[in-house]
C-alpha cells in the first residue's frame, strides 16, 4: 500500500521544506484516500464487470450512505463553512462502518483497504482539530453500527458485490465534494 502523507521519504529527506499547513495536510490526506479508492474500485471492476452500471443505480439502493445535500452548506450556492465542516466530519464518521465492511472484500488489495480505513480515521482527527463546534457532531451509535455490519455481511455474494461497489462510489463522491468545499475554507 502507498505510504500515508507525511510519512514518505521525501518529507524526511527535505527538512528545509516548509511544513504543511493544516489545510494542505487535509487536502493531501483526502487525495491520498481517493487514490486508495481508485485502486480498490479497479479490483472490484475487474472481478465482476461492475463498473459499467448506470448512475441511477446509486440512488436505487437501501444503503443509508452519507451524501451531500444543499442544506449541508458545502456547495457554492449557500456555502456555510461551519455547517459544512460538521457535515463532512459527521459523514466520515458514518462511513467508518462501511469501511470496516470493506476490510474482508478484497483479495489482492487487502492492504489498500486497510490503508483507506486508517487514513480516514486520521482525516477525521485533522478535521476535528479544525472544527470549532464539536458539540454539533453526532457520533454513530456503536450498537446500530454492529447490527448494520452483521446485516451487510449476511447478504448473498451478488449483493455484497453491489454493496462494495456502492460504498466505494459513494465514498469517492463524498470525498470529492468535501475536497471542493474545504478548498473554499
Amino acid at each position: 500500500a502507498p505510504v500515508p502523507p507525511g510519512e514518505d521519504s521525501k518529507d524526511v529527506a527535505a527538512p528545509h521544506r516548509q511544513p504543511l499547513t493544516s489545510s494542505e495536510r487535509i487536502d493531501k490526506q483526502i487525495r491520498y484516500i481517493l487514490d486508495g479508492i481508485s485502486a480498490l474500485r479497479k479490483e472490484t471492476c475487474n472481478k465482476s464487470n461492475m463498473c459499467e452500471s448506470s448512475k441511477e443505480a446509486l440512488a436505487e439502493n437501501n444503503l443509508n450512505l452519507p451524501k451531500m445535500a444543499e442544506k449541508d452548506g458545502c456547495f457554492q450556492s449557500g456555502f456555510n463553512e461551519e455547517t459544512c465542516l460538521v457535515k463532512i466530519i459527521t459523514g466520515l464518521l458514518e462511513f467508518e462502518v462501511y469501511l470496516e465492511y470493506l476490510q474482508n472484500r478484497f483479495e489482492s488489495s487487502e492492504e489498500q483497504a486497510r490503508a483507506v480505513q486508517m487514513s480516514t480515521k486520521v482525516l477525521i482527527q485533522f478535521l476535528q482539530k479544525k472544527a470549532k463546534n464539536l458539540d454539533a457532531i453526532t457520533t454513530p451509535d456503536p450498537t446500530t453500527n454492529a447490527s448494520l455490519l452483521t446485516k451487510l455481511q449476511a447478504q448473498n455474494q451478488w449483493l455484497q458485490d453491489m454493496t462494495t461497489h456502492l460504498i466505494l462510489r459513494s465514498f469517492k463522491e463524498f470525498l470529492q465534494s468535501s475536497l471542493r468545499a474545504l478548498r473554499q475554507m
Epitope: 465482476s48 464487470n49 459499467e52 452500471s53 448506470s54 436505487e60 448473498n156 455474494q157 451478488w158 453491489m162
Partner: antibody, heavy 118, light 107 residues
C-alpha cells in the same frame, strides 16, 4: 402482468454461435436481477448465468465460463445470452427468469430449445 | 462451488400423505434457499424462497424450513396436482446451483 419471452434458439453445429434474447414486460426491468437456467432433455435444472440489477455483476457456471456472455439492455427491457463455441452438451431448453427480492426466481419464460449437433 | 444434494431422488406417495424432501448444501448458505416445482414440458414454478417464505399464490400446504446447510420442503397433505419434480436452489454464492431434483410419483 409479468411476461418473459425467449427467442433465438435453434439448431447449430458444434463450435457455432447463437444469441438468445428474453423480452421482459410488466415490471421495472432495470431494478431486477435476471438469470438463465437450462435443462438438457430428461435432465434436471442447471443454473447457467446471472446478471444483477443495473448490470453491476455478471456471473457464470463453470461449464460455460469463457464461452457464454450475459448482458442486458435496460432501455429495451431485454436480457441476452451470447453463446459461442457451442458443444453437444449445451443442447437444452434455455429459460430466462427474474430474481425475486428474496432471491428466488419468481417468473420464468416458456423456454427456447437450443440443439447443438452436426 | 456449492453442491446441493436432494434426498430422496424419487418417492411414491398417495393423495393426502404428508411428504418431506430434504436438501443439503456443501457449505453454509444462510437462508438463501429456494424450492421449485416443475411439471413435464413446463417452466419451473417458485414455491418457497428464503428457506421458509411462501411465494404469493402458492397453497399453504407447502412449507419450508432450515438454515445454514440443512433444509426441508414439506407438503402437509398431497393433492393430485402436486405430483411433479421438486428442485432446491441456493442463491447465496456467486453461482446459484440447483439440487438434482426429487420426482414425486403417485403410489
Amino acid at each position: 402482468e409479468v411476461q418473459l419471452l425467449e427467442s433465438g434458439g435453434g439448431l447449430v453445429q458444434p463450435g457455432g454461435s447463437l444469441r438468445l434474447s428474453c423480452a421482459a414486460s410488466g415490471f421495472t426491468f432495470g431494478y431486477s436481477s435476471m438469470g438463465w437456467v437450462r435443462q438438457a432433455p430428461g435432465k434436471g435444472l442447471e443454473w447457467v448465468s446471472g446478471i444483477s440489477s443495473y448490470g453491476y455483476g455478471t456471473y457464470y457456471a463453470d461449464s460455460v465460463k469463457g464461452r457464454f456472455t450475459i448482458s442486458r439492455d435496460n432501455s429495451k427491457n431485454t436480457l441476452y445470452l451470447q453463446m459461442n463455441s457451442l458443444r453437444a452438451e449445451d443442447t437444452a431448453v434455455y429459460y430466462c427468469a427474474r430474481y425475486h427480492s428474496g432471491w428466488g426466481m419468481d417468473y420464468w419464460g416458456q423456454g427456447t430449445l437450443v440443439t447443438v449437433s452436426s | 462451488d456449492i453442491q446441493m444434494t436432494q434426498s430422496p431422488s424419487s418417492l411414491s406417495a398417495s393423495v393426502g400423505d404428508r411428504v418431506t424432501i430434504t436438501c443439503r448444501a456443501s457449505q453454509s448458505i444462510s437462508s438463501y434457499l429456494n424450492w421449485y416445482q416443475q411439471k413435464p414440458g413446463k417452466a419451473p414454478k417458485l414455491l418457497i424462497y428464503a428457506a421458509s417464505s411462501l411465494q404469493s399464490g402458492v397453497p399453504s400446504r407447502f412449507s419450508g424450513s432450515g438454515s445454514g446447510t440443512d433444509f426441508t420442503l414439506t407438503i402437509s397433505s398431497l393433492q393430485p396436482e402436486d405430483f411433479a419434480t421438486y428442485y432446491c436452489q441456493q442463491s447465496f454464492a456467486y453461482l446459484h446451483t440447483f439440487g438434482q431434483g426429487t420426482k414425486l410419483e403417485i403410489k
